[in-house]
Interface confidence: low
């Protein structure tokens, strides 16, 4: 009764197609699979960025897999062949591991790479990224930004740079068709006559860096002798009402400050008959139903009511 053995996959490699972090892991079937012609061989693939504590694990029948990585760090991967128990009249058989690594050899010292990279997707419409030059670079250094997301044939360079003192310090992106809810990859590299410049890689999803416009058309209406309803409207743009959270700041008679977070475009406030003045501002943010994260908008213009008879007034900004 001979022990069943299987070889690891052949030609296991990590291929960089130039998508700034979206890499291909590919391999060939193991040698000597003739005994298992009737059997569907599977592969267990494990991979991670070097320094990460956990491996991602995939079991597949394919000869390739694609995923995004942080190219600021190295990548390591390993794969072995699995023969399901149906093929071996018993327990599952595993080959030894085939292993491979990939990294982009870093150029220049860390101080030369861009600092404080900040990207904001304004109103889910306009992407703008800005950065500061590395703290160890001269004015002859210039930075270039490249980006890619699934749907583009190849990485594209920024065509509309923001400049200061002749250096590129930001990028205004063109309209980015079908670019949300998927990984968006950026590389900022640089060139200098004096020294090599360290590249930086960034990955995010656009819906998580949205900064909406502030709410508009703030109004007051008296609901009862002791209740006032505050209302506002969502700003123009592509963000649907269901995607907003709001934060309200209310000041009564210049003393009490009330803050509240709500999901709708209204807020009911308890007041007393002694209230002489009421002011409020609102700001908005994309909520957890539409993104994992977001940036608060600027505050709206302040809307105030002063006087005796709130019941006769509905104030529009």
């Amino acid at each position: 009764d001979t022990e069943i053995k299987v070889n690891p996959p052949q030609d296991f490699e990590i291929v960089d197609p130039g998508y700034l972090g979206y890499l291909y892991l590919q391999w060939q079937p193991p040698l000597s699979l003739d005994h298992f012609k009737e059997c569907t061989v599977e592969y267990e693939l494990k991979y991670r960025n070097i320094g990460s504590e956990t491996w991602k694990t995939i079991i597949t029948k394919n000869l390739h897999y694609k995923d995004g990585f942080d190219l600021n760090k190295g990548i390591e991967a390993k794969i072995h062949t699995l023969l399901p128990w149906q093929c071996t009249n018993g327990s599952e058989v595993q080959s030894s591991w085939a292993e491979t690594t990939y990294w982009i050899s870093p150029q220049g010292i860390p101080e030369t790479k861009v600092q404080d990279m900040d990207c904001v997707y304004y109103n889910w419409q306009y992407l703008l990224c800005s950065w500061k030059p590395g703290i160890g670079v001269l004015l002859d250094t210039n930075y270039n930004l490249f980006y890619w997301y699934e749907g583009l044939d190849h990485a594209l360079q920024c065509v509309d740079y923001i400049k200061a003192d002749g250096q590129n310090i930001g990028c205004r992106f063109p309209y980015l068709e079908a670019s949300d809810y998927k990984d968006f990859y950026i590389c900022v590299n640089g060139s200098s006559e004096n020294k090599p410049i360290r590249s930086s890689y960034f990955t995010f999803q656009l819906q998580n860096i949205v900064k909406p416009l502030p709410p508009v058309y703030l109004t007051f209406t008296r609901e009862s002798s002791c209740e006032i309803k505050l209302k506002w409207s969502i700003p123009l743009g592509p963000i649907p009402a269901r995607c907003f959270d709001y934060e309200i700041e209310i000041r009564e008679d210049d003393t009490t400050l009330v803050t509240a977070t709500v999901e709708n475009e209204t807020y009911t406030l308890k007041t007393t008959n002694e209230t002489r003045q009421l002011c409020f501002v609102v700001r908005s943010k994309v909520n957890i139903y539409c993104s994992d994260d977001g940036i608060w908008s600027e505050w709206s213009d302040k809307q105030c009511w002063e006087g005796e008879d709130l019941s006769k007034k509905t104030l529009l900004r």
Partner: antibody, heavy 119, light 111 residues
Framework: QVQLVQSGAEVVKPGASVKVSCKAS????????MNWVRQAPGQGLEWIGR????????HYNQKFKDRVTMTVDTSTSTVYMELSSLRSEDTAVYYC????????????WGQGTLVTVSS | DIQMTQSPSSLSASVGDRVTITCRAS??????????MNWFQQKPGKAPKLLIY???RQGSGDPSRFSGSGSGTDFTLTISSLQPEDFATYFC?????????FGQGTKVEIK
């Protein structure tokens, strides 16, 4: 939190070698350099060299260049410093210290390893 | 090698005093618009602790009473109001050129 844990004290004979380890945790190991600094009893600080935990590149103080070897094991997040042809004046506390880049300083240090060279 | 000279080598001060330690490099430690100068605090039997990097930037979690200044060859560490836990030895260090070099240290003692 960031921790650098060094191997224990060593007593070695003149002419021998010593290998000190520094195990890092609490941060992305390969993003940083590891420096080695020594301090003889009652004396100041002396920089021995550093190793890039990502690429294994080393920069040594010329004073130690022929006697020091720094290595890195990324699988265990450990850096090693080996000093050979030891003499009595190498008796010192040896520290590992993390650094991001030249301008950022050495922001976390190991607890130190006392190496005593004595016959 | 760049030589680092600290002064004074020791000083006595009282809690609440303003303390200034100076460090002079044998050549400029400025490069690319930044000063590659760091300051460390060391207490007996302990590892050094980074206080200031790039001449004036505070290390993480360090009290604001520690500040650094200077450029080129002359640098200063200032403790605005000395606290009991500040009695220690202070070292300057340049990281512009390998080998990185330290000052000989300034011991701050209780008066």
């Amino acid at each position: 939190q960031v921790q650098l844990v060094q191997s224990g004290a060593e007593v070695v004979k003149p002419g021998a070698s010593v290998k000190v380890s520094c195990k890092a945790s609490g941060y992305t190991f390969t993003n940083y350099w590891m420096n080695w600094v020594r301090q003889a009893p009652g004396q100041g600080l002396e920089w021995i060299g550093r190793i890039d935990a990502y690429a294994g590149e080393t920069h040594y103080n010329q004073k130690f260049k022929d006697r020091v070897t720094m290595t890195v094991d990324t699988s265990t997040s450990t850096v090693y410093m080996e000093l050979s042809s030891l003499r009595s004046e190498d008796t010192a506390v040896y520290y590992c210290a993390r650094g991001y880049g030249d301008a950022y300083g050495m922001d976390h240090w190991g607890q130190g390893t006392l190496v005593t060279v004595s016959s | 090698d760049i030589q680092m000279t600290q002064s004074p080598s020791s000083l006595s001060a009282s809690v609440g005093d303003r303390v200034t330690i100076t460090c002079r490099a044998s050549e400029s430690v400025d490069n690319y618009g930044i000063s590659f100068m760091n300051w460390f605090q060391q207490k007996p039997g302990k590892a050094p602790k980074l206080l200031i990097y790039a001449a004036s930037r505070q290390g993480s979690g360090d009290p604001s009473r520690f500040s650094g200044s200077g450029s080129g060859t002359d640098f200063t560490l200032t403790i605005s109001s000395l606290q009991p836990e500040d009695f220690a030895t202070y070292f300057c260090q340049q990281s512009k050129e390998v080998p990185w070099t330290f000052g000989q240290g300034t011991k701050v003692e209780i008066k």
